[in-house]
């Protein structure tokens, strides 16, 4: 069987969504009304991976995009890039460890932890209309805590 | 024993609004991931509301967006749907239930709460 | 979405008959089905998960089969305590929904 996939939206715990910026970048901003239309929607699939009951892997795509969230070195840092992929192929069940992220909930709580890179979180900043970004921080002033809205096929 | 009882269901004019609680007893609810599923009169079955076992998460389908809203305490075991701008479509019996979005049945039910919606 | 129609809707059977309901997805639902049975003023009640796996507890006699989008729900040998409303359930893909049910009945 193919991999289940479902589709969501996220905001971080300040309310801000997530849109596109670019072709290949996100940014966080606050949306109200008619523009929460142009928040980005995920196509959420669950993946092959070490799972709890708090941790679930998943890999991050755009709906009906062949782009899907994933995290490299750059210039020796962990950073989180969107990458363009052949959709024959994706989303699988097997999915490279770049492209995987541990769905972590704890007390009303969900962090993304890249599962290449444990203790590096999807992330965004206090401000508004910054890009989307892999963190090495829990707790400080970046933000790494997400809700999660998932939306009908 | 696990169980799961409802309450706050009754008689209400469209428009209005009503408040609906489970009670969650017998196994770890913090853990567990839960929905409100209902059933109009002598009809099938419509799933409604779903939070994840945090509260992190959520999902409606388009029939009741924007209308109702899931909530939980689990520090009080407890289960919520808020239901506002009700209308005589959502009149039926509504069950607390465990499961969600990821196991994606439910595998314990609670006797159901009727709900009427009319003038 | 996917929708889910049961067949037949309603069915009269004997105690000890074997009785198979169908649930066809619009759809490919890959396994992701369930069973409920729902008895007179009761709450439903999970049977079986992922096509065929029996929940904790369910009396052997109840089975489950299929895949892609056609699934079928037998009862080997019928017990007056089977008489209920039995729906089957996906959960591929959002929204998962219900049959419409089967009406099981004894003669």
């Known amino acids: 069987a193919p991999v289940r996939s479902l589709n969501c939206t996220l905001r971080d715990s300040q309310q801000k969504s997530l849109v596109m910026s670019g072709p290949y970048e996100l940014k966080a901003l606050h949306l109200q009304g008619q523009d929460m239309e142009q928040q980005v929607v995920f196509s959420m699939s669950f993946v092959q991976g070490e799972e709890s009951n708090d941790k679930i892997p998943v890999a991050l795509g755009l709906k009906e995009k062949n782009l899907y969230l994933s995290c490299v070195l750059k210039d020796d840092k962990p950073t989180l890039q969107l990458e363009s992929v052949d959709p024959k192929n994706y989303p699988k069940k097997k999915m490279e460890k770049r492209f995987v992220f541990n769905k972590i909930e704890i007390n009303n709580k969900l962090e993304f932890e890249s599962a290449q890179f444990p203790n590096w979180y999807i992330s965004t900043s206090q401000a508004e209309n910054m890009p989307v970004f892999l963190g090495g921080t829990k707790g400080g002033q970046d933000i790494t805590d997400f809700t999660m809205q998932f939306v009908s096929s | 024993e696990v169980q799961l009882v409802e309450s706050g269901g009754g008689v209400v004019q469209p428009g209005r609004s009503l408040r609906l609680s489970c009670s969650a007893s017998?196994?770890?609810?913090?853990?567990?991931?839960m929905s409100w599923v209902r059933q109009a009169p002598g009809k099938g079955l419509e799933w409604v509301a779903y939070?994840?076992?945090?509260?992190?998460?959520?999902y409606y389908p388009d029939s009741v967006k924007g209308r109702f809203t899931i909530s939980r305490d689990n520090s009080k075991n407890t289960l919520f749907l808020q239901m506002d701008s009700l209308r005589p479509e959502d009149t039926g019996v509504y069950y607390c239930?465990?499961?969600?979005?990821?196991?994606?049945?439910?595998?314990?039910w609670g006797q159901g709460t009727p709900v009427t919606v009319s003038s | 979405g996917i929708q889910m129609t049961q067949s037949p809707s309603s069915l009269s059977a004997s105690v000890g008959d074997r009785v198979t309901i169908t649930c066809r997805a619009s759809?490919?639902?890959?396994?992701?089905l369930t069973w409920y049975q729902q008895t007179p003023g009761k709450a439903p009640k999970l049977l079986i998960y992922?096509?065929?796996t029996l929940a904790d507890g369910v009396p052997s006699r109840f089975s489950g089969s299929g895949s892609g989008t056609d699934y079928t729900f037998t009862i080997s040998s019928l017990q007056p305590e089977d008489i209920a409303t039995y729906y089957c359930?996906?959960?591929?893909?959002?929204?998962?929904?219900f049959g419409q049910g089967t009406k099981l009945q004894i003669t």
């Open positions: 239930a465990r499961g969600g979005v990821y196991k994606g049945y439910f595998d314990v």
């Open positions: 017998g196994f770890i609810f913090s853990k567990y991931d």
């Open positions: 939070i994840s076992h945090g509260g992190a998460g959520t």
């Open positions: 759809g490919n639902i890959y396994t992701y």
């Open positions: 992922n096509a065929k």
């Open positions: 359930q996906h959960f591929w893909t959002l929204p998962y929904t």
